[in-house]
């Protein structure tokens, strides 16, 4: 029962985690304009992995996609790759883990096969979670580096006359979503791996049948089974089914002149 619970919980936690990784990857707020100790503007900038957006105090929001591949920073490309790999591995892991769930009966699938599938999905979830955490951390590191660089050069003189204020960016909501989601996927993966150990069928223990002949004690061992020297009852190899199968199942918003958003 504990194995089923661990496996089921691992699946649910991973499912939530992967949904979070997908959400984080799609979110526009990976980096947001730093408003602290900065000249306050009537325009708020934020950026995602796929597009950058500007929200005016008028309510008008304009998002522009990054329509270039070669012109983008290598780090951004790396983060994109890590997140996509995380999503793909997580999705495959979810697919595998559905068939591995102990509460779902598929044909005459052996426990050993379910155990292997549980382990495989667990490892996939762990790698998926690590990819997401790594991707988000690389982006966060990039932000921190750029933040301090722009702070150092915050006011750059233009001909000694005019000051231009550089926009500084800080952590956006997507980073926190990504970290939490990656962590959940990782935890789910670990739980699947733990469940796998409980699923793996141990070699059956049968009591040795002793025939006492004159003076000699000979133990006859039924073929194909390992003899046990102990006489304790073996309950570890019982198959438990808890009922039938269960299924788990460049944008712009315009405020009209007459209808303010």
């Amino acid at each position: 029962m504990a194995v089923t619970a661990c496996q089921g919980l691992g699946f649910v936690v991973s499912l939530i985690g992967i949904a979070g990784i997908i959400a984080a990857t799609c979110m526009d707020q990976w980096s947001t304009q730093d408003l602290y100790n900065n000249p306050v503007t009537a325009v708020f900038n934020y950026q995602g992995l796929w597009r950058s957006c500007v929200r005016e105090s008028s309510g008008f929001t304009e998002c522009r996609g990054y329509f270039t591949l070669l012109g983008l920073p290598a780090m951004l490309q790396a983060v994109r790759a890590l997140m996509i790999v995380g999503i793909v591995l997580g999705a495959i892991g979810l697919l595998v883990s559905i068939f591995a769930l102990k509460c779902i009966r598929i044909g005459s699938m052996e426990d050993s096969a379910k155990a292997n599938m549980t382990l495989t999905s667990g490892i996939m979830f762990i790698v998926s979670g690590l990819c997401a955490i790594a991707g988000v951390s690389v982006f966060a590191n990039m932000l921190v580096t750029n933040f301090w660089m722009s702070t150092a050069n915050m006011y750059t003189g233009m001909g000694g006359m005019v000051q231009t204020v550089q926009t500084r960016y800080t952590f956006g909501a997507a980073l926190f979503v990504g970290w939490v989601a990656g962590g959940l996927t990782l935890i789910g993966g670990v739980m699947m791996c733990i469940a796998c150990r409980g699923l793996a069928p141990e070699e059956t223990n049968y009591k040795a049948v002793s025939y006492h002949a004159s003076g000699h004690s000979v133990a006859y061992k039924p073929g194909g089974f390992k003899a046990s020297t102990g006489f304790g009852s073996n309950t570890k190899n019982k198959k438990i089914y808890d009922g039938g199968a269960r299924t788990e199942d460049e944008v712009q918003s315009y405020p009209s002149k007459h209808d303010y958003v």
């Epitope: 325009v43 008028s58 000051q163 303010y260």
Partner: antibody, heavy 117, light 113 residues
Framework: QVQLVQSGAEVVKPGASVKVSCKAS???????VHWVIQAPGQGLEWMGE????????NYNEKFKKRVTMTLDRSTSTVYMELSSLRSEDTAVYFC???????????WGQGTLVTVSS | DIVMTQSPDSLAVSLGERVTLNCKSS????????????LTWYQQKPGQPPKLLIY???TRESGVPDRFSGSGSGTDFTLTISSVQAEDVAVYHC?????????FGGGTKLEIK
């Protein structure tokens, strides 16, 4: 038709306060409404803004201690109250609705406030 | 605060003449996020509230005659009236719509000779 209709002219004594209203009609009352002051023969000066959605306001530091912007959602009306009036506060006060580029597309007709003893 | 400096303070031109009004800001009004300049031009006639002409430094408001055009980026901006008409007599204001407090220029008074 979009309209911002302001209250009528006022004559007030120095040290007193004045409350100017701005009633919006013809559009959904959900975005920032700004207040702008124009002294006789002078340029325009931004006083502050209020968001009818959440009643949050931002004020120009110059007026911060004396100005209060409030609203009445039931009548789609924004109010601007200026206290401790001085003779130099004699001006036309405009309310304006925000538009693309944070520009002011719709303006009230203006309210002349005369501070005189 | 951002200082908006308009020049000239006033000018008198003949009907049909091309006129250029200037506006300079003490800081760049260009937003890197969308590459738009947050500068607005208004026309104000005596006894009336200002009227929106141009926003984002060069986008003409609907209903504004196409003889009005805005240009410039960063800190230097221009409002051009390609052929001045009698009804263009007014004070023209530029406004910083990027930094708080939102500031206006002193205005340029346009008259007909």
């Amino acid at each position: 038709q979009v309209q911002l209709v302001q209250s009528g002219a006022e004559v007030v004594k120095p040290g007193a306060s004045v409350k100017v209203s701005c009633k919006a009609s013809g559009y959904t009352f959900t975005n920032w409404v700004h207040w702008v002051i124009q002294a006789p023969g002078q340029g325009l000066e931004w006083m502050g803004e209020i968001n009818p959605t959440n009643a949050r306001s931002n004020y120009n530091e110059k007026f911060k201690k004396r100005v209060t912007m409030t609203l009445d959602r039931s009548t789609s009306t924004v109010y601007m109250e200026l206290s401790s009036l001085r003779s130099e506060d004699t001006a036309v006060y405009f309310c304006a609705g925000i538009y693309y580029g944070n520009s002011f597309a719709h303006w009230g007709q203006g309210t002349l406030v005369t501070v005189s003893s | 605060d951002i200082v908006m400096t308009q020049s000239p303070d006033s000018l008198a031109v003949s009907l049909g003449e091309r006129v250029t009004l200037n506006c300079k800001s003490s800081q760049s009004l260009l937003n890197a996020g969308n590459q738009k300049n947050y500068l607005t031009w208004y026309q104000q006639k005596p006894g009336q509230p200002p009227k929106l002409l141009i926003y984002w430094s060069s986008t003409r408001e609907s209903g504004v005659p196409d003889r009005f055009s805005g240009s410039g980026s960063g800190t230097d901006f221009t409002l051009t009236i390609s052929s001045v008409q009698a009804e263009d007599v007014a004070v023209y204001h530029c406004q910083n719509n990027y930094y708080y407090p939102l500031t206006f220029g002193g205005g340029t008074k346009l008259e007909i000779k």
